[in-house]
């Protein structure tokens, strides 16, 4: 069966029907490049005016305008708000009332696209494997990133969150139109990774999405993540304004000027040098969501009532912090280089500025307890990674899970830890799952490109697709079309249940209280320490006059860019992390 031309609110669209075997039978209808909104520079997205005739939706559209890897140029375009749809089809009748999974990509709110990184036309976020294996509709889309998506003056002149509003427009478009493609508009699951996972979290918290989202999955990221909310947007807006020659004293004039500035100049005005900085890399993520009093009306911690009826899976990778650790403490990955106590203390103090010396010392002490017994470089390096993983991913995710559970009415809550080790040959032998390592398995790459993977990788991928799509179908990862290797029990506040995802998932993979000692430390011991820097949100970060252009991560999904270089400024860095 195949859909042919589909009538949407914008007009007719026609994709391609791809047979899954030479013998016929099952197939997948693929639509690429359907417009869901339009947007002017630094303005909220608007409804798309539509078209006449039949739109041939056969090619991915260009990504939203962003800096290239070398950061001396841009790629993508401003006209970028398009989505892609994969609809699995059986032999006879066209699909009807299928669950819908809407993907939000990561990339530090700075880079990325709905199709993801590609190698020889093999796109990372190709929805075919999820759609056909799980019998769900998969939707991916582009949203604005970087300054064009998140620049904000912190007031009504440039409220920011344009990229979040793009995401909302895509979700709302799916709600209104997906029935025509055979989807169930009342069963939409949004899922994402890293900045996309934080976006998923923010979308569930926003009052704008009331009634649109049934379920959500956040992979390595939350609205509560320290890198997910910009508390000092005006500083960064002024930084960009200065670089492009706009006035900075009056936000109205600054906004008006920025809106008529060449979007490529705006994009390139924010550069990410690779050199290690005085502060951890996440402090330099400038263009990210803000609390605008509207789309995000309050601090995310106060918005969990909005998720009371949204089923949620949230989890992290067991070494999510590794990618960040390699930037903040480069010796972590280098066998011939050593990590010193001083290196680690500097990292700790950079993440605990708000609590001053006491905060840094208490944190350093608890994380280095094992060093007396095992002072090996391997143990010290693993500690650095564990610390970054905890601060940036685990603790925010655990707090979010507890908040979700505490506010739940009909909603169910599930937690996981992805522990299938990275396949990167250059990594140390002790390496676990790095940031973004989960993506290839969720998107079924071990099946799509089998020669690059082992049977154990296919086992991981099969299990993840089964759990994810069952959850999308029923709100329970165990119940649906796909058999699962073991029962995944819901998260409870008492036990902190989580599923440990490895190559062999058994009943023993259901575990409890992940890193309980450290969670208690951050939630209790650290939390009660006095804040020493006053209101850390009002402090300004070091100014950046550098023009050095580094190589950011080449994979769209990788969250962390490298911060701006500035050796001349010794100013106090504000804590963007507040536990």
């Amino acid at each position: 069966a195949k859909l042919g031309a589909v009538y949407t609110e914008g007009g007719f669209v026609e994709g391609v029907n791809k047979k899954l075997s030479l013998l016929g039978g099952d197939s997948v209808d693929i639509f690429k490049g359907i417009p869901f909104a339009t947007a002017k520079t630094l303005e909220n997205p608007q409804r798309h005016p539509g078209w006449q005739g039949t739109l041939k939706a056969t090619n991915f559209k260009k990504r939203c305008l962003q800096a290239t890897i070398t950061q001396d140029n841009t790629y993508g375009q401003e006209d970028c708000l398009y989505l892609n749809i994969w609809v699995p089809q059986g032999r006879k009748q066209v699909s009807h009332n299928l669950p819908v999974m809407v993907w939000i990509y990561g990339g530090a709110f700075l880079m990325g696209s709905g199709q993801g990184a590609n190698f020889l036309k093999n796109y990372l976020y190709d929805g075919e494997e999820i759609a056909t294996r799980g019998n769900v509709i998969v939707v991916t889309f582009n949203y604005r990133v970087g300054p064009l998506g998140f620049l904000s003056t912190g007031d009504a002149n440039l409220p920011g969150n344009f990229g979040l509003r793009d995401q909302h427009m895509a979700i709302a478009w799916v709600k209104r139109n997906i029935a025509a493609f055979g989807g169930d508009p009342d069963n939409i699951t949004i899922f994402g990774e890293s900045a996309g996972a934080a976006s998923v979290s923010l979308q569930t918290l926003s009052p704008y999405n009331k009634g649109l989202i049934r379920r959500a999955i956040s992979q390595s990221g939350m609205a509560l993540s320290p890198w997910a909310i910009q508390k000092n947007p005006l500083f960064w807006a002024k930084t960009i304004a200065k670089k492009v020659g706009c006035p900075t004293e009056d936000t109205g004039k600054m906004a008006a000027c920025l809106k008529i500035t060449d979007p490529r100049a705006l994009t390139l005005a924010y550069k990410l040098p690779v050199k290690k900085q005085e502060y951890p890399v996440v402090h330099y993520l400038a263009f990210i969501p803000v609390i605008d009093g509207d789309f995000i009306p309050d601090d995310p911690i106060n918005l969990y009532n909005n998720t009371a009826d949204i089923d949620y899976i949230a989890g992290i990778n067991n070494m999510d912090g590794h990618l960040f650790a390699t930037i903040d403490v480069p010796a972590v990955d280098k066998t011939k280089q050593t990590v010193t106590e001083e290196d680690f203390y500097r990292l700790v103090s950079g993440h605990t500025v708000a609590k001053g010396l006491k905060g840094a010392q208490a944190t350093f002490d608890i994380y280095t307890e094992s060093w007396a017994q095992d002072p090996s470089q391997e143990n010290m390096k693993k500690t650095v990674v564990a610390f970054e993983t905890d601060v940036l991913f685990l603790i925010p995710t655990e707090i979010a899970l507890a908040q979700h559970k505490a506010h739940a009415k009909s909603a169910k809550t599930y937690s996981y830890l992805f522990s299938h080790p990275s396949r990167m040959p250059i990594y140390p032998k002790w390496m676990g799952a790095d940031h973004a390592d989960d993506l290839q398995y969720v998107f079924g790459k071990p099946f799509a490109t089998p020669l690059g993977y082992r049977p154990q990788d296919r086992a991981v991928s099969k299990a993840m697709i089964a759990y994810w799509t069952n959850f999308a179908r029923s709100g329970d990862p165990n119940m649906g079309n796909s058999p699962v290797p073991t029962h995944w029990y819901p998260y409870t506040l008492e036990n902190g249940n989580y599923l440990d995802i490895t190559k062999t998932i058994t009943s023993a993979s259901m575990k409890e209280h992940l890193r309980e000692k450290f969670l208690k430390f951050w939630a209790v011991t650290f939390e009660v320490l006095p804040t020493v820097t006053g209101d850390q949100d009002t402090l300004t970060p070091p100014e950046d006059d550098s023009e050095v252009a580094p190589d950011p991560p080449s994979d769209d999904s990788q969250v962390v860019p490298v911060p701006p270089t500035d050796d001349s400024v010794e100013a106090q860095m504000p804590a963007t992390i507040g536990f």
């Epitope: 031309a5 949407t8 007009g11 005016p49 539509g50 078209w51």
Partner: antibody
Framework: QVQLVQSGAEVKKPGASVKVSCKAS????????MHWVRQAPGQGLEWMGV????????SYNQKFQGRVTMTRDTSTSTVYMELSSLRSEDTAVYYC????????????WGQGTLVTVSS | DIQMTQSPSSLSASVGDRVTITCRAS?????LNWYQQKPGKAPKLLIY???SLASGVPSRFSGSGSGTDFTLTISSLQPEDFATYYC????????FGQGTKLEIK
């Protein structure tokens, strides 16, 4: 100027079929979608479906699926709406209506064709 | 399908009056239009995209709203305005409101 001229009134028996035509002029026929909307006596408007005259693509209201067929003849700039298995509740005025622009409202309407279904 | 509910279903007013008709969608919509229909005639487009005036329509007609709540306002009723008004949502399955009959008081 844009004109949509529909065929004349029809009286049909239950179970029969009716085919209503709508001849377009004053614009490029293949460039705009054509919709069919009906209105039962004293009732409101009900969307039946749409056809793209360019390639013949159609989409029908679920309610009429299997009973309605929309076709077009580009040589005469005419669209047709055929409704089968007629019942008394299909008695209505049937309108063709052209899109205004883009994914826009129904900007131009035919004069309507009364179809009466009676035994 | 999205249900469109108009209120009131009928309304009596006098020439010169200001009249407001509301239309509520059962879920958020992107495209809303207003039509006027006189007895024995085809509907005529008045307002499209919630607030844009169709060509040739007098400026006394205006539309507003977004999401689920929309209004059609006639600032000063003229004798030729007495008719039935319909709202219409344009989606993959378009639907109309049940109509509001505007009569002379």
């Amino acid at each position: 100027q844009v004109q949509l001229v529909q065929s004349g009134a029809e009286v049909k028996k239950p179970g029969a079929s009716v085919k209503v035509s709508c001849k377009a002029s004053g614009y490029t026929f293949t460039s705009y979608n054509m919709h069919w909307v009906r209105q039962a006596p004293g009732q409101g408007l009900e969307w039946m479906g749409v056809i793209n005259p360019g390639d013949g693509a159609t989409s029908y209201n679920q309610k009429f699926q299997g009973r309605v067929t929309m076709t077009r003849d580009t040589s005469t700039s005419t669209v047709y709406m055929e409704l089968s298995s007629l019942r008394s509740e299909d008695t209505a005025v049937y309108y063709c209506a052209r899109d205004y622009y883009g994914s826009s409202p129904l900007g131009y309407w035919g004069q309507g064709t009364l179809v009466t279904v009676s035994s | 399908d999205i249900q469109m509910t108009q209120s009131p279903s009928s309304l009596s007013a006098s020439v010169g009056d200001r009249v407001t008709i509301t239309c509520r969608a059962s879920s958020s919509i992107s495209y809303l239009n207003w039509y006027q229909q006189k007895p024995g005639k085809a509907p005529k487009l008045l307002i499209y995209a919630a607030s844009s005036l169709a060509s040739g329509v007098p400026s006394r007609f205006s539309g507003s709203g977004s999401g689920t709540d929309f209004t059609l306002t006639i600032s000063s009723l003229q004798p030729e305005d007495f008719a039935t008004y319909y709202c219409h949502q344009r989606s993959s399955s378009p639907t109309f409101g049940q109509g509001t009959k505007l009569e002379i008081k």
